[in-house]
């Protein structure tokens, strides 16, 4: 049976899928589709890679990891309840019946009502350099923005607030990291 993954409405959903390239840069085609993996293909394709690059994608669907190293995990931006369902990751390894196929179940929950709905915007505006994301390029991370002048009290207060917030869950679930100091 498929593995289940969860996200809230308005969040980004993350569906993991990996393979190990035979050699660096020796990529195999991969497709992501909505619906369970059929016998040969990917269902309703939302993203596809070839031996070199992402060659097809639809809005809101992207690869946040380094697909050149075999991380072909799918990120779905700003999910709605309609995004719930089965997704197919198919690694189209050349040869006779070598495909690896994975069915992943995405469950979207209604958004929780939080007392501090502006926290995420405020935090990223004040501390843009604290967010690092996995990138497409050879570098493992991309640093966003530059560090503004802040004091330790601000950092401490915001870090405590962040620990219990939905943002902390968002960041942890999406694979982003928070660096303080």
């Amino acid at each position: 049976s498929e593995v289940e993954y969860r996200a809230e409405v308005g969040q980004n959903a993350y569906l993991p899928c990996f393979y190990t390239p035979a050699a660096p840069g020796n990529l195999v085609p991969v497709c992501w589709g909505k619906g369970a993996c059929p016998v040969f293909e990917c269902g309703n394709v939302v993203l596809r890679t070839d031996e070199r690059d992402v060659n097809y994608w639809t809005s809101r669907y992207w690869l946040n990891g380094d697909f050149r190293k075999g991380d072909v995990s799918l990120t779905i931006e700003n999910v709605t309840l309609a995004d719930s369902g089965i997704y197919c990751c198919r690694i189209q390894i050349p040869g006779i019946m070598n495909d690896e196929k994975f069915n992943l179940k995405l469950v979207i929950k209604p958004a929780k009502v939080t007392p501090a709905p502006t926290l995420q915007r405020d935090f990223t505006a004040a501390f843009p350099r604290m967010l690092t994301t996995r990138g497409h390029g050879p570098a493992e991370t991309q640093t966003l923005g530059s560090l503004p002048d802040i004091n330790l009290t601000q950092i401490s207060t915001l870090a405590n607030e962040l620990r219990d917030s939905r943002l902390a869950n968002d960041l942890r679930d999406s694979g982003a990291t928070i660096r303080i100091g």
């Epitope: 085609p29 369970a36 016998v39 293909e41 309703n44 050349p94 040869g95 019946m97 069915n103």
Partner: antibody, heavy 119, light 111 residues
Framework: EVQLVESGGGLVQPGGSLRLSCAAS????????MSWVRQAPGKGLEWVAA???????YYPDSVKGRFTISRDNAKNTLYLQMNSLRAEDTAVYYC?????????????WGQGTLVTVSS | EIVMTQSPATLSVSPGERATLSCRAS??????????MQWYQQKPGQAPRLLIY???NVESGIPARFSGSGSGTEFTLTISSLQSEDFAVYYC?????????FGGGTKVEIK
């Protein structure tokens, strides 16, 4: 208009080889899984080989190791290389397009090409 | 492999009558709530033509008198009122597993 046109059939001796071609037009060939399906005279349909859009290959045991399916997306052409042919391989060979997003069933077929294996 | 068995081998029907063709799979062809079963029509000297996919979905351009039903291992193709152009051989096919397999066919002939 989707068109699939097979060629390359003919008479061949047992143990011989033949290469079938299927020229595709009217659709984005590279996006589709493609198959070969055969039909012996007076008999039913038998799936022979498939190649996915990503190039993965599939065969039934009856032809595995003897037949090779391949595709040239630049030429919009599907191929079937048949080696070590046997009398029981005598059939009309159809090129068939797998349904988009699935590939496991066939929404367009060629007219077929006859392969006769006989001494 | 999944073995597909069609019955009857030959069905004699008068024009205007209803025809019911059966197909049984040796194991279930259900997959995430969908029956991966198709039906094709083949006339002499012609390539097969897709009629029904996923057990009950009528292919574009196919007359409404053709319908499919069933789930699991038992499937039916129904032609509600046979027209002269419907006399042909009909095949079922499963697309759950490799090897893809077809039934032996049912010949629908004029009574």
């Amino acid at each position: 208009e989707v068109q699939l046109v097979e060629s390359g059939g003919g008479l061949v001796q047992p143990g011989g080889s033949l290469r079938l071609s299927c020229a595709a037009s009217g659709f984005t060939f590279s996006r589709y899984a493609m198959s070969w399906v055969r039909q012996a005279p007076g008999k039913g349909l038998e799936w022979v080989a498939a190649i996915s859009s990503g190039g993965s290959l599939y065969y039934p045991d009856s032809v595995k190791g003897r037949f090779t399916i391949s595709r040239d997306n630049a030429k919009n052409t599907l191929y079937l290389q048949m080696n070590s042919l046997r009398a029981e391989d005598t059939a009309v060979y159809y090129c068939a397009r797998g349904r988009e997003a699935d590939g496991g069933y066939f929404d367009y077929w060629g007219q077929g090409t006859l392969v006769t294996v006989s001494s | 492999e999944i073995v597909m068995t069609q019955s009857p081998a030959t069905l004699s029907v008068s024009p205007g009558e209803r025809a019911t063709l059966s197909c049984r799979a040796s194991e279930s062809v259900e997959y995430y709530g969908t029956s991966l079963m198709q039906w094709y029509q083949q006339k002499p000297g012609q390539a097969p033509r897709l009629l029904i996919y996923a057990a009950s979905n009528v292919e574009s351009g196919i007359p409404a008198r053709f319908s499919g039903s069933g789930s699991g291992t038992e499937f039916t193709l129904t032609i509600s009122s046979l027209q002269s152009e419907d006399f042909a051989v009909y095949y079922c096919q499963q697309s759950l597993k490799v090897p893809l397999t077809f039934g032996g066919g049912t010949k629908v002939e004029i009574k």
